[in-house]
């Protein structure tokens, strides 16, 4: 057994449409067949769940229909996209990876990605 390491970028800038994408990579110590990936937002000491998905290795990552997240998986790498972000959503987004099956269970937590969101300036009215 060895601890599971999770890597994610330190900083990401959301697009003007409020979309942020980043890669969450984990060093799997075992041959997991079922993996759960959770995105958490940490503000002060409060940690809230943004979205979560469980997938079988080799299959696609599927978030719930009403989730603000989408993602794809490739080996030990998950490409995550969070949409609908606004300036007030700027914060630290932590990637949490759990190897659910087979035993033993492993937990890995990334250091977090600081996502900066800048609301677009409203278009000035045009006089014709």
């Amino acid at each position: 057994c060895k601890a599971m390491h999770v890597a994610q970028p330190a900083v990401v800038l959301a697009s003007s449409r409020g979309i942020a994408s980043f890669v969450c990579e984990y060093a799997s110590p075992g041959k997991a067949t079922e993996v759960r990936v959770t995105v958490l937002r940490q503000a002060d000491s409060q940690v809230t769940e943004v979205c979560a998905a469980t997938y079988m290795m080799g299959n696609e990552l599927t978030f719930l229909d009403d989730s603000i997240c989408t993602g794809t998986s490739s080996g030990n790498q998950v490409n995550l996209t969070i949409q609908g972000l606004r300036a007030m959503d700027t914060g630290l987004y932590i990637c949490k990876v759990e190897l659910m099956y087979p035993p033993p269970y492993y937990l890995g937590i990334g250091n977090g990605t600081q996502i900066y969101v800048i609301d677009p300036e409203p278009c000035p009215d045009s006089d014709f």
């Epitope: 057994c1 958490l40 940690v47 659910m100 033993p104 269970y105 492993y106 937990l107």
Partner: antibody, heavy 118, light 108 residues
Framework: QVQLVESGGGVVQPGMSLRLSCAAS????????MHWVRQAPGKGLEWVAV????????HYADSVKGRFTISRDSSKNTLYLQMNSLRAEDTAVYYC???????????WGQGTLVTVSS | EIVLTQSPGTLSLSPGERATLSCRAS???????LAWYQQKPGQAPRLLIY???SRATGIPDRFSGSGSGTDFTLTISRLEPEDFAVYYC?????????FGPGTKVDIK
């Protein structure tokens, strides 16, 4: 506020069965892993079992594997521990605990005492 | 399984003194997955520190955690009367999740 309340403890004879319950309130029960931890009289803490999220995955300590079954009913916000073939060494206070967002056990019940004695 | 060893077994100190508790793992533990709990007689454990160094909600700043790999430390900068209790470290990164045997901090 988060609350966990265990029940079902008592005195049983070796070889008998007992089912513990843990009623949860104040949080979205199905979104958290839930654990049982026990403490023998005058001893330290021993992790017993965990059930994850939707209830499909469970893990157990070797000392209880094959004898204890952890389960959950999300419609009732209740966690269970079915204990079969009880032994004297299972005598302990049994706590249910919530696995927090970042994994540590952030909330605990007050515990229920199980005594296995002939 | 990962075995956690705590030292000393008992620490006898006076209020106002500094307490340093050690937790050593039999193999490397992710610092994200190391916690400290406080337990008083007749009570359930209470989470103090998670992720080796982050204080849980409502925990006073006299409690601090540090360490990585196999060596972790809980420090209580100035002991208050209510801090005399048993302290357990725990790893929750790999099942089975394991606790150390505990360090009892008692009044000298």
């Amino acid at each position: 506020q988060v609350q966990l309340v265990e029940s079902g403890g008592g005195v049983v004879q070796p070889g008998m069965s007992l089912r513990l319950s843990c009623a949860a309130s104040g949080f979205t029960f199905s979104s958290y892993g839930m654990h049982w931890v026990r403490q023998a009289p005058g001893k330290g803490l021993e992790w017993v079992a965990v059930i994850w999220y939707d209830g499909n995955n469970r893990h157990y300590a070797d000392s209880v594997k094959g004898r204890f079954t952890i389960s959950r009913d999300s419609s009732k916000n209740t966690l269970y521990l079915q204990m079969n073939s009880l032994r004297a060494e299972d005598t302990a206070v049994y706590y249910c605990a919530r696995g927090g967002r970042l994994g540590a056990f952030d909330y605990w019940g007050q515990g229920t005492l199980v005594t296995v004695s002939s | 399984e990962i075995v956690l060893t705590q030292s000393p077994g008992t620490l006898s100190l006076s209020p106002g003194e500094r307490a340093t508790l050690s937790c050593r793992a039999s193999q490397s533990v992710s610092s994200s997955c190391l916690a400290w709990y406080q337990q008083k007689p007749g009570q359930a454990p209470r989470l103090l520190i998670y992720g080796a160094s982050s204080r849980a909600t409502g925990i006073p700043d006299r409690f601090s955690g540090s360490g990585s790999g196999t060596d972790f430390t809980l420090t209580i900068s100035r002991l208050e009367p209510e801090d005399f209790a048993v302290y357990y470290c725990q790893q929750y990164g790999i099942s089975p999740f394991t606790f150390g045997p505990g360090t009892k901090v008692d009044i000298k």
